[in-house]
Amino acid sequence: MKVLQEPTCVSDYMSISTCEWKMNGPTNCSTELRLLYQLVFLLSEAHTCIPENNGGAGCVCHLLMDDVVSADNYTLDLWAGQQLLWKGSFKPSEHVKPRAPGNLTVHTNVSDTLLLTWSNPYPPDNYLYNHLTYAVNIWSENDPADFRIYNVTYLEPSLRIAASTLKSGISYRARVRAWAQCYNTTWSEWSPSTKWHNSYREPFEQH
């Protein structure tokens, strides 16, 4: 049994880091393998993660990290019984993938303005709380070409757009994702999408 593709890990910088790797053949990850992880700190606790299958030869492990700071560095040991298959390290702050925003809502009752709001996925005491920026994706269910991205570079989790920038009388969907420049993170996953019917009063044309 050998590791074909070494573990790569990302952290949500809150409570979970996810590591994925591939074995050289079909593997029952949860029964055959264990990923041990420990903060590089002489009095730290060693923890064991039981991996799950992620495709035939792929494994994924969700490492619980109750508290993360930028100084943290973890040792990772992948074991198959008594055999050490791989040894590595992981610094969560250098591999951050933020949590996806939630509770995306489209408020259509503001005069001819669409107000999109969502929730910051972090609590106020987390470092990322004040460092997230967002991308909002809006698309038409009827017209695949009607697809747009709005970059929200301010901290407030909301976006206002004129309803007239979208076509009237058709349904749209929106979703939002986050990233943090401070840790050069990857983008989060998209939030679940929300749907609304776009309608607005055409301005009366005078002749």
Epitope: V40, F41, L42, E45, T48, L64, D66, D67, V69
Partner: antibody, heavy 118, light 111 residues
Framework: EVRLVESGGGLVQPKGSLKLSCEAS????????MNWVRQAPGKGLEWITH??????????YYADSVKDRFIISRDDSESMVYLQMNNLKTEDTAMYYC?????????WGQGTSVTVSS | DIVLTQSPASLAVFLGQRATISCRAS??????????MHWYQQKAGQPPKLLIY???NLESGVPARFSGSGSGTDFTLNIHPVEEEDAATYYC?????????FGSGTKLEMK
Amino acid sequence: EVRLVESGGGLVQPKGSLKLSCEASGFSFNMYAMNWVRQAPGKGLEWITHIRSKSNNYATYYADSVKDRFIISRDDSESMVYLQMNNLKTEDTAMYYCVRLLRALDYWGQGTSVTVSS
Amino acid sequence: DIVLTQSPASLAVFLGQRATISCRASKSVSTSGYSYMHWYQQKAGQPPKLLIYLASNLESGVPARFSGSGSGTDFTLNIHPVEEEDAATYYCHHSRELPITFGSGTKLEMK
């Protein structure tokens, strides 16, 4: 919010026994090493004992001043840490704090007071 | 055991000035790129509160006027500018090995 609440302190005679409890909440208790630190009236801080997590076989460590008299234990299912204190001496009079250890002793309870006097 | 020698034992400074507290370890508390020295503030009738961990990292929620530096055996806590609410006793502490030990404390007062 991380909370540690100590209880069980009080007045006890020399050579007597006392059991302190610490209730933890607001964090994944089973992942952390837990400690007791004490502070005699008007004095500095003294670490006295440490218990590791299940994955580290609940290993325990003691300061020389309490070795063979004090026993630390934990119950992960109840998020509790205990300190059984036997053969108490007058010099054990102190405020006893339950403390979580991660990179440092980062969260402290409010403490419970123990007085050893005849 | 690692002995931590803190100085001065007490310190009086004017509001807005700098307070500097030193902590010397009897052997190095640094290894693998980390310095396992930490600083606490304790006010009367309260438990200690973590200010600085791993020599120089500010604990969440602690004002930026607190800073820590040092490596090996010599460490420093700086408070600048000192405010009225900073009157307290400050302790250094190492977690390099067991037994964990503390400095004897520095009492900070305002002039």
